[in-house]
């Protein structure tokens, strides 16, 4: 809609809105210790932080229920924080018949908006 | 990932975990009776409901995102619940040469999972 | 182009059901509402109700409330209208428009005669 | 309910000549976003209604431009330039203000 627009600036201050962060996780935290080899640490990108009214709004549906929230907070919920592209990462993982390479193109996120 | 399963039984009681919800919103619950001409009140289905521990998880980030939240859950947001899917809707508005039809493929949400 | 092709014509007794089926032939209801009107032998056209999407909840005159029901399936791009309690007076052409809201009914089905006879 | 009254209830008409029909609503069809709710539709022997004019004077896709819609509030008139031998049929109004949806009693256009 032209009549509602998505801003990028953060009301509630620095570092307090929906961004990508970066979380250091191993294996053993996934529980993946025992079929990924290898990296054996990862480096997750995550969508973290608040979806204040109309912060980096995903598409239509996310400005709408911003503006629903507002007038039912009880009923609607605020958009939240989630990725709105991914990179891809290759896993080596133990198989049946041995050893493979996988890429996974929905494990770290890339970017963030308010969906 | 092979080794966490997304699930589909909520944990915690009927209507409690992510699923659509209808809402009838009127164009001046929207902010879009200036603009919009019919049809003069909508039906926006939306996500709501909580994202317990691998209740329909998006993909594998939200998988992980889950799995992580549970260790670090000041740090680590859960998955929240949003759309998977969007059902079209045509709206008659105004324009500056009079009237126009417009289909918006991303106002009223279809599905929903845990992101 | 997209067209409403409805389900053909009935005979009814009196107090059964009817369920008339509309399908867009040539693509989906792309987000249009469905509207539900019907025409009495040599009378004027009277609206019933509709339904927009997400096809979730739909919207009757008073005249029908409690005896018309009106549901879409996105799946199969097909709208229906139940008219339970028939009488002799329901003897008419009924038809399905795709329109924005209740506005704009550009597309109209072929029409589904039903006769309510004893 | 909105009530719909049309006039006349039959209009003979000589192709090539003008023709005016009359539709008034027991209340305004006019909305606070300065529309009037007001369809016109035509339905030809032996077929489904067409769409011909919404909004009161917007003129639907692909319908020749010798149909044009006028009027605000309770009265609205729709006319036909040169009327031509495919012309004939009813015509009804309809109002989209409020539900339920009402549509005039119609006006029967034939070929003098």
């Known amino acids: 809609s032209a009549h509602l627009h998505p801003r990028d600036s953060c009301p509630l201050g620095p570092g307090r809105c929906c961004h990508l962060e970066t979380v250091q996780a191993t294996l053993e935290d996934l529980g993946w210790s025992d079929w990924v080899l290898s990296p054996r640490q990862l480096q997750l990108s995550m969508c973290v932080g608040e979806c204040p009214h109309l912060y980096r709004s995903a598409n239509t549906h996310a400005l709408i229920k911003a503006r629903l929230h507002g007038l039912q907070p009880d009923r609607v919920p605020a958009p939240c924080c989630v990725p709105s592209s991914y990179t891809p990462v290759v896993l080596m993982h133990r198989t049946d018949s041995g050893v493979s390479l996988q890429t996974y193109d929905d494990l770290v996120a890339q970017g963030c908006h308010c969906a | 990932s092979a080794h966490l399963h997304p699930r589909d039984s909520c944990p915690l009681g009927p209507g409690r975990c992510c699923h659509l919800e209808t809402v009838q919103a009127t164009l001046e619950d929207l902010g879009w009776s200036d603009w919009v001409l019919s049809p003069r009140q909508l039906q926006l289905s939306m996500c709501v409901g909580e994202c317990p521990h691998l209740y329909r998880s998006a993909n594998t980030h939200a998988l992980i995102k889950a799995r992580l939240h549970g260790l670090q859950p000041d740090r680590v947001p859960a998955p929240c619940c949003v759309p998977s899917s969007y059902t079209p809707v045509v709206l008659m508005h105004r324009t500056d040469s009079g009237v126009s039809l417009q289909t918006y493929d991303d106002l009223v949400a279809q599905g929903c999972h845990c992101a | 182009q997209v067209q409403l092709v409805q389900s053909g014509a009935e005979v009814k007794k009196p107090g059964s059901s009817v369920k008339v089926s509309c399908k867009a032939s040539?693509?989906?209801?792309?987000?249009?509402?469905i509207s539900w009107a019907r025409q009495a032998p040599g009378q004027g056209l009277e609206w019933m109700g509709g339904?927009?999407?997400?096809?979730?909840?739909?919207n009757y005159a008073q005249k029908f409330q409690g005896r018309v029901t009106i549901t879409a399936d996105e799946s199969t791009s097909t709208a229906y209208m139940e008219l339970s309690s028939l009488r002799s007076e329901d003897t008419a052409v009924y038809y399905c428009?795709?329109?924005?809201?209740?506005?704009?009914?550009?597309?109209w089905g072929q029409g589904t005669m039903v006769t309510v006879s004893s | 309910d909105i009530v719909m009254t049309q006039s006349p209830l039959s209009l003979p008409v000589t192709p090539g000549e003008p023709a005016s029909i009359s539709c008034r609503s027991s209340?305004?069809?006019?909305?606070?976003?300065?529309?009037?709710?007001l369809d016109w539709y035509l339905q030809k022997p032996g077929q489904s209604p067409q769409l011909l004019i919404y909004?009161?004077?917007n003129r639907a896709s692909g319908v020749p431009d010798r149909f044009s819609g006028s009027g605000s509030g309770t009265d609205f008139t729709l006319k036909i330039s040169r009327v031509e031998a495919e012309d004939v049929g009813v015509y009804y109004c309809?109002?989209?203000?409020?539900?339920?949806?009402?549509f005039g009693g119609g006006t029967k256009v034939e070929i003098k």
């Open positions: 428009a795709r329109g924005v809201g209740e506005l704009h009914l550009d597309v």
């Open positions: 040539g693509g989906t209801f792309q987000g249009y509402a």
């Open positions: 339904i927009i999407p997400p096809y979730a909840t739909a």
């Open positions: 209340q305004s069809l006019l909305h606070s976003n300065g529309y009037n709710y």
């Open positions: 909004l009161g004077s």
């Open positions: 309809m109002q989209a203000l409020q539900t339920p949806i009402t």
